[in-house]
């Protein structure tokens, strides 16, 4: 019973974690404009792994994709790769773990096979979680480095006169989502590995004995009756994220001049 609970909980935790990794990867707010100790601007800049966005005080938001591969920093490419590897491993892990669940009976799958699948999915979840944590941490490190570099260069200009105030970026919501999601996936993986130990059949000194009754041939094996249950999931994944640090309360996307009515 404890094994089933541990395995089930590990699966659910990993599922939430992987959903979080996917959400973090898709989010636009990996880095957001630093508003502290900065000249207050009427625009708010934020960037993701795939595009950068600008929100004006009018609420009008414009996002531009990074339509180049070669022109992007190697670190950003590495982060993208880590997150995608994390998602792929996590997705495969989920697929494997569904079949490994003790509460689901698929054909005449042996417990040893389920144990192996549970261990495999557990390892996949652990690696997936580590990939996500590594990806987010690399990006965070990149941000910290750039933050201090831009702080040092912030008030430099031609002839000592301030020409441009550099936009500094700080941690966005996606980083925190990624760290938490990676952690959950890792924990889920560890739980699956723990459950695997309980699933592995112990060696017994006797073999299955067949008792022949007249006219019938019924085989009895040691071990209790395993109930077969259908395990359905109706989880809706909605990507919901806010505009980050706003200087205004709630602003919606701006309509065209003629939409004012």
């Amino acid at each position: 019973m404890a094994v089933t609970a541990c395995q089930g909980l590990g699966f659910v935790v990993s599922l939430i974690g992987i959903a979080g990794i996917i959400a973090a990867t898709c989010m636009d707010q990996w880095s957001t404009q630093d508003l502290y100790n900065n000249p207050v601007t009427a625009v708010f800049n934020y960037q993701g792994l795939w595009r950068s966005c600008v929100r004006e005080s009018s609420g009008f938001t414009e996002c531009r994709g990074y339509f180049t591969l070669l022109g992007l920093p190697a670190m950003l490419q590495a982060v993208r790769a880590l997150m995608i590897v994390g998602i792929v491993l996590g997705a495969i892990g989920l697929l494997v773990s569904i079949f490994a669940l003790k509460c689901i009976r698929i054909g005449s799958m042996e417990d040893s096979a389920k144990a192996n699948m549970t261990l495999t999915s557990g390892i996949m979840f652990i690696v997936s979680g580590l990939c996500a944590i590594a990806g987010v941490s690399v990006f965070a490190n990149m941000l910290v480095t750039n933050f201090w570099m831009s702080t040092a260069n912030m008030y430099t200009g031609m002839g000592g006169m301030v020409q441009t105030v550099q936009t500094r970026y700080t941690f966005g919501a996606a980083l925190f989502v990624g760290w938490v999601a990676g952690g959950l996936t890792l924990i889920g993986g560890v739980m699956m590995c723990i459950a695997c130990r309980g699933l592995a059949p112990e060696e017994t000194n006797y073999k299955a004995v067949s008792y022949h009754a007249s006219g019938h041939s019924v085989a009895y094996k040691p071990g209790g009756f395993k109930a077969s249950t259908g395990f359905g999931s109706n989880t809706k994944n909605k990507k919901i994220y806010d505009g980050g640090a706003r200087t205004e309360d709630e602003v919606q996307s701006y309509p065209s001049k003629h939409d004012y009515v």
């Epitope: 207050v40 601007t41 009427a42 800049n45 600008v54 005080s57 441009t164 602003v251």
Partner: antibody, heavy 118, light 113 residues
Framework: QVQLQQPGAELVKPGASVKLSCKAS????????LHWVKQRPGQGLEWIGM????????NYNEKFKTKATLTVDKSSSTAYMQLSSLTSEDSAVYYC???????????WGQGTLVTVSA | DIVMTQSPSSLTVTAGEKVTMSCKSS????????????LTWYQQKPGQPPKLLIY???TRESGVPDRFTGSGSGTDFTLTISSVQAEDLAVYYC?????????FGSGTKLEKK
């Protein structure tokens, strides 16, 4: 279409206060920041500040922080600007304008002429 | 605060003439995030509120005649009227829409020769 109604003129005594109104229609009042701009006779334009009608959060030009107070009444889609301790320097036309693309002002009220005179 | 310097302060023109006026800001109005310059041009006639002509330094507002063109980037901006009409006689203001507090130039007055 977008309309911003402002009273034509206000005559006030030095040292007194005046509350100017700006009634908005033709757009979702609570969705867009509303700005106030001052223009002295024959002079240029000066940005006073802005208010977000939804939450009431404000951002003032340092120069007008002690002079102007911005408020809104969501139920009537009206923005207000109270000017205190009036002097002859405050005699001007005051405009209200909601923010537009590029943080610009596409729509303006007709302006309220405030005359400070004994 | 950002200082907006407009020149010349006044221009005497004749109908059909090409006119150029300048606006300089004390700091760059270019936002690196979208490569847009947050500078706006307004036209104001006596007794009227300002009218939006150009935003994002070069985007013409709908309904504004195409003889009005905005250009420039960073700190230097220009408003060009390709062929001045009688109804264009007014004061033209540039505005910093990037940094708070928003600031306006002192204006360029277009007068009839």
């Amino acid at each position: 279409q977008v309309q911003l109604q402002q009273p034509g003129a206000e005559l006030v005594k030095p040292g007194a206060s005046v509350k100017l109104s700006c009634k908005a229609s033709g757009y979702t009042f609570t969705s867009y920041l509303l700005h106030w701009v001052k223009q002295r006779p024959g002079q240029g334009l000066e940005w006073i500040g802005m208010i977000h009608p939804n939450g009431g959060s404000t951002n003032y030009n340092e120069k007008f922080k002690t002079k102007a107070t911005l408020t809104v009444d969501k139920s009537s889609s009206t923005a207000y600007m109270q000017l205190s301790s009036l002097t002859s320097e405050d005699s001007a036309v005051y405009y209200c304008a909601p923010v537009y693309f590029g943080n610009s002002f596409a729509y303006w009220g007709q302006g309220t002429l405030v005359t400070v005179s004994a | 605060d950002i200082v907006m310097t407009q020149s010349p302060s006044s221009l005497t023109v004749t109908a059909g003439e090409k006119v150029t006026m300048s606006c300089k800001s004390s700091q760059s109005l270019l936002n690196s995030g979208n490569q847009k310059n947050y500078l706006t041009w307004y036209q104001q006639k006596p007794g009227q509120p300002p009218k939006l002509l150009i935003y994002w330094a070069s985007t013409r507002e709908s309904g504004v005649p195409d003889r009005f063109t905005g250009s420039g980037s960073g700190t230097d901006f220009t408003l060009t009227i390709s062929s001045v009409q009688a109804e264009d006689l007014a004061v033209y203001y540039c505005q910093n829409d990037y940094y708070y507090p928003f600031t306006f130039g002192s204006g360029t007055k277009l007068e009839k020769k």
